[in-house]
């Protein structure tokens, strides 16, 4: 029932334009190029878009014509390294060019830029966008797929042509709509909050297969789709890891038209599958491809069968686990973990991981032991901390989160985190504390039985967002060791560590707390992130500050910002109450 | 712990064939991929081919493909490199390695920790 198996192509470009149509070809060699040469501008890339096409079309008509045998990599890398200002433009990116395939795509794959410089995305007046959607809807829309793929090179694509659909939908009523606005701009805002989210849930995939490979990348399907879909046999679950392992593969590594052609296959096999998958497959197999794929990819979990036995006769009383475990350990394994988390979808998948790594490790001792069964029979027992610490850690957090609200929930967090490791940039803190701080409206309003697959899986996807971002310039031996030591054991290695005792204060200066009116013109996010920024500043020139201390100074800051926004010489105010808050504040800290 | 150990270099004429062998002992499990690398003299370390040794799915360097075959004996734990048509090119000393993880870029000689001390393949005439 292997879904991948193809005959082999004469030309393989040729292949996959006939599987993908022309839009969906075109749309998905832009977004590989936009991922690749994020710096190049939209007319370049849609020229060298264009040239691939008509090469494709080609090569459709006769695929035995000049150059259709070469790979995909072969035919988009000759195509990049043709840009003329490829050195002057990415530096040492342009010596992937003197190597040959597969060692130049994998150059290529390892500049991508987890934060490029690139201007912010400013939103023009609706109208203005209006006029540019009527105007060349295709242009427009193009510019939406470029814009998105520069920005998160690691971008699903399969997925980005889900959220250009939506877009397009967008535009299209709203357009027409008798108050615009009113119409666009929150779908908008939901597009981009939900893309930022599905460009973080990637990335960890992504950085999963990069930094820890296959094997880890597989255990974690295993256990996420056995919760999905606890109805389902092992044979059946390891078919779909194995499918699915082989997509996100190829999305990561830039095979963008072999991953959306897979990725619709699985969705067929799911489909026609779903009486032994799951019973919550209904509705979105009745939907159009794209839709399709991403309902399958967010389904809720299936209801657990009944009567499902004790774990405990085949993994832990059973004579038979030693030779289970020796004949076979992969698949041992993999079946346990099935085992435990269809029966767990209380759990975090990180937490299933860590109970099954636990379990290994017992295995690999015992079974090496005078007597095994005797040494790994309280194993289960050695799972009880396990659980508990992500269950407390959720517990304190939430009611923290309720009783402070998402703001100052986030200020706590920042002030944790920025004592923790003081010399990771200060965005970098302000970007990743807001967002573990998100944590709280997420996933506190769940009900206990859904708390911690929520918190503890989102708080993966936010810390991998710190791990990429301080890989590019590491400047903390102690978010490198955590980052690297263990992917599951990530968020218990940040939560353990106390305040860096080796961290020489920030020298202060007064520059940096110094503010202008136009703080008074940012929305309201805008002006918290000024806030926050000068938190993280605040803590990294008195990291021994106490909260209290803290406190006082951010809601000193808080009045100053809302008098001197009041005052009819903003300017003026910001000047002369500016100098007054920082001798306060110096001296509130003791600085 | 792995340990590789190459063998089957050696001096051979342009267009000639060569078959090499590494031997892997300690624990290689199926989620292993194993790769040859080679290294000329003055030049940077260069990735030749790879083969997860789960599903025996393969990748080769452009300018061997179609002349070199990467292959592996499960039961001997032997990996093999059989290369045809030798050009002087190819002059290089030739390596084993191990990814037990099978890491996503399988071209980097950084993602395998475990490398066998190479072995001589000279082409000439």
């Known amino acids: 029932r292997g879904v991948f198996r193809r005959d082999a192509h004469k030309s393989e470009v040729a292949h996959r334009f006939k599987d993908l149509g022309e839009e969906n070809f075109k749309a998905l060699v832009l977004i590989a190029f936009a991922q690749y040469l994020q710096q190049c501008p939209f007319e370049d890339h849609v020229k060298l878009v264009n040239e691939v096409t008509e090469f494709a079309k080609t090569c459709v008509a006769d695929e035995s014509a000049e150059n259709c045998d070469k790979s995909l990599h072969t035919l988009f890398g000759d195509k990049l390294c043709t840009v003329a200002t490829l050195r002057e433009t990415y530096g040492e990116m342009a010596d992937c060019c003197a190597k040959q395939e597969p060692e130049r795509n994998e150059c290529f794959l390892q500049h991508k830029d987890d934060n490029p410089n690139l201007p912010r995305l400013v939103r023009p007046e609706v109208d203005v966008m209006c006029t540019a959607f009527h105007d060349n809807e295709e242009t427009f829309l193009k510019k939406y797929l470029y814009e998105i793929a520069r920005r998160h090179p690691y971008f699903y694509a399969p997925e980005l042509l889900f959220f250009a659909k939506r877009y397009k939908a967008a535009f299209t009523e709203c357009c027409q709509a008798a108050d615009k606005a009113a119409c666009l701009l929150p779908k908008l805002d939901e597009l981009r909050d939900e893309g930022k989210a599905s460009s973080a849930k990637q990335r960890l995939k992504c950085a999963s297969l990069q930094k820890f490979g296959e094997r880890a990348f597989k255990a974690w399907a295993v256990a996420r789709l056995s919760q999905r879909f606890p109805k389902a046999e092992f044979a059946e679950v390891s078919k779909l890891v194995t499918d699915l392992t082989k997509v996100h593969t190829e999305c990561c590594h830039g095979d963008l038209l072999e991953c959306a052609d897979d990725r619709a296959d699985l969705a067929k096999y799911i489909c026609e599958n779903q009486d032994s998958i799951s019973s919550k497959l209904k509705e979105c197999c009745e939907k159009p491809l794209l839709e399709k794929s991403h309902c399958i990819a967010e389904v809720e979990n299936d209801e657990m069968p009944a009567d499902l036995p004790s774990l405990a006769a085949d993994f832990v009383e059973s004579k038979d686990v030693c030779k289970n475990y020796a004949e076979a350990k992969d698949v041992f394994l993999g079946m346990f973990l099935y085992e435990y988390a269809r029966r767990h979808p209380d759990y975090s998948v990180v937490l299933l991981l860590r109970l099954a790594k636990t379990y290994e490790t017992t295995l690999e001792k015992c079974c090496a032991a005078a007597d095994p069964h005797e040494c790994y029979a309280k194993v289960f027992d050695e799972f009880k901390p396990l659980v508990e610490e992500p269950q407390n850690l959720i517990k304190q957090n939430c009611e923290l989160f309720e009783q402070l609200g998402e703001y100052k929930f986030q200020n706590a967090l920042l002030v944790r985190y920025t004592k923790k490791v003081p010399q990771v940039s200060t965005p970098t803190l302000v970007e990743v504390s807001r967002n573990l701080g998100k944590v709280g409206s997420k996933c506190c309003k769940h009900p206990e039985a859904k708390r911690m697959p929520c918190a503890e899986d989102y708080l993966s996807v936010v810390l991998n967002q710190l791990c990429v971002l301080h890989e590019k310039t590491p400047v903390s031996d102690r978010v490198t060791k955590c980052c690297t030591e263990s992917l599951v054991n990530r968020r218990p290695c940040f939560s353990a560590l106390e305040v860096d005792e080796t961290y020489v204060p920030k020298e202060f200066n007064a520059e940096t707390f110094t503010f202008h009116a136009d703080i008074c013109t940012l929305s309201e996010k805008e002006r918290q992130i000024k806030k926050q920024t000068a938190l993280v500043e605040l803590v990294k020139h008195k990291p021994k500050a106490t909260k209290e201390q803290l406190k006082a100074v951010m809601d000193d800051f808080a009045a100053f910002v809302e008098k001197c926004c009041k005052a009819d010489d903003k300017e003026t105010c910001f000047a002369e109450e500016g100098k007054k808050l920082v001798a306060a504040s110096q001296a509130a800290l003791g600085l | 712990e792995v340990q590789l150990v190459e063998s089957g270099g050696g001096l051979v004429q342009p267009g000639g064939s060569l078959r090499l062998s590494c031997a892997a002992s300690g624990r290689t499990d199926s989620a292993y991929r194993m790769g040859w690398f080679r290294q000329a003299p003055g030049k940077e370390r260069e990735f030749v081919s790879a083969?997860?040794?789960?599903?025996?799915?393969?990748v080769y360097l452009d300018s061997v493909k179609g002349r070199f075959t990467i292959s592996r004996d499960n039961a001997k734990n032997t990996l093999y490199l059989q290369m045809n048509s030798l050009r002087a090119e190819d002059t290089a000393v030739y390596y084993c390695?191990?990814?037990?993880?099978?890491?996503?870029?399988?071209?980097?000689?950084?993602?395998?920790?475990?490398w066998g001390q190479g072995t001589q393949v000279t082409v000439s005439s």
């Open positions: 390695a191990a990814d037990p993880d099978s890491r996503l870029y399988y071209t980097v000689p950084q993602n395998y920790d475990y």
């Open positions: 083969i997860n040794w789960s599903d025996g799915r393969t």
